[in-house]
Amino acid sequence: MAVTACQGLGFVVSLIGIAGIIAATCMDQWSTQDLYNNPVTAVFNYQGLWRSCVRESSGFTECRGYFTLLGLPAMLQAVRALMIVGIVLGAIGLLVSIFALKCIRIGSMEDSAKANMTLTSGIMFIVSGLCAIAGVSVFANMLVTNFWMSTANMYTGMGGMVQTVQTRYTFGAALFVGWVAGGLTLIGGVMMCIACRGLAPEETNYKAVSYHASGHSVAYKPGGFKASTGFGSNTKNKKIYDGGARTEDEVQSYPSKHDYV
């Protein structure tokens, strides 16, 4: 029962995590304009992995997609790649884990196969979570570097009199979503791996041994060998419970001129 609960919880946690990774990847608020100690502007800039947006005091928001591939920073491309790999691995992991769930019966699938599938999905979730955490962390590091660079020369003089205020960017909501989601996916993966241990039939094969005692001759022959996953060294004979067949671009989000009523 505990194994089923651990596996089910691992699946749910991973599902939430991957949904979060997808959400973070799609979000526009990876970096947001730093408002602290800055002149108050009537526009608010924020950027995502796929487009940058400007929200005006007027209520209009304008978003422009990054329509170039080669002109983008290598770091941004790397972050995109990490997030996409994380999503793909997570999605495959989810698909595999659905069939691995103990509460779902598919034909005459053996528990050993379910154990292997659980382990596979667990590893996929772990790698997926690590990809998301790495991607978000790389982007965060990029932001921190750029923040201090722009702080160092925040006011760039133009002909002495005129000044251009550089827009500084700080952590956006997507980073926190990404970190939490990556962590959840990682935890879910670990739970799946733990559940795998309990799923695997681990009956140890005892060779037939003859004990020659005075006046008696008793031979103990335990049951035949069953496949083991090799996790741990538990030599107890476990009863394998069968769960049974249960039925359980340049885009502008402008309203029309006056949004007439």
Partner: antibody, heavy 118, light 113 residues
């Protein structure tokens, strides 16, 4: 057609208070930022206050900060300007305006005269 | 605060001639996020509220005749009327729409010579 109709102007003594109202129609009021702008006789336009869209953000120039308060009632489609501690230099024609692309003001009221005099 | 300097204070131009009004900002009004200049131009006739001509420095508001042109970037902007008409007599204002407090230029009074 967008319409902005003001009320509440008049003559007030220095140190007194006045509340201007601006009733809006012809557009979805809650979706747009709104501003108050004034113009003293023979002078340039002077921005007085803005109520930003998408959050309760209000902005004022130093000349009126702490004395004037901009507010809005989306259910009544009305913008307000509460003016306290009025001074002679606050005498002007007050306009309410709807914000548009680029934070420009595309629709204006006809203007309301406010005179601060003893 | 951002200082907006408009020149000239007044301008007399013959009908059909070109009129040019300049506007200078003490800081750049270019937003790096969308590469747009947050400068607005208005026309005000006596006894009337201002009328929007251009936003984002050069985007003409609907209904504004195409003899009006807005140009410029960063700190220097220009409003040009290619062929002055009698109905163009008014005071023209430019406005910083990027930084709070929003500030207006002193206005340019355009008259017919």
């Amino acid at each position: 057609e967008v319409q902005l109709v003001e009320s509440g102007g008049g003559v007030v003594q220095p140190g007194g208070s006045l509340r201007l109202s601006c009733a809006a129609s012809g557009f979805t009021f809650s979706k747009f930022g709104m501003s108050w702008v004034r113009q003293a006789p023979g002078k340039r336009l002077e921005w007085v206050a803005t109520f930003s869209s998408g959050g309760d953000y209000t902005f004022y120039p130093d000349s009126v900060k702490g004395r004037f308060t901009i507010s809005r009632d989306n259910s009544k489609n009305t913008l307000y300007l509460q003016m306290n501690s009025l001074r002679a230099e606050d005498t002007a024609v007050y306009y309410c305006a709807k914000l548009y692309y680029g934070n420009s003001m595309d629709s204006w009221s006809q203007g309301l005269s406010v005179t601060v005099s003893s | 605060d951002i200082v907006i300097t408009q020149s000239p204070d007044s301008l007399a131009v013959s009908l059909g001639e070109r009129a040019t009004i300049n506007c200078k900002s003490s800081q750049s009004l270019l937003n790096s996020g969308n590469q747009r200049n947050y400068l607005t131009w208005y026309q005000q006739k006596p006894g009337q509220p201002p009328k929007l001509l251009f936003y984002w420095a050069s985007t003409r508001e609907s209904g504004v005749p195409d003899r009006f042109t807005g140009s410029g970037s960063g700190t220097d902007f220009t409003l040009t009327i290619s062929s002055l008409q009698a109905e163009d007599v008014a005071v023209y204002y430019c406005q910083n729409a990027y930084y709070y407090p929003f500030t207006f230029g002193g206005g340019t009074k355009l008259e017919i010579k």
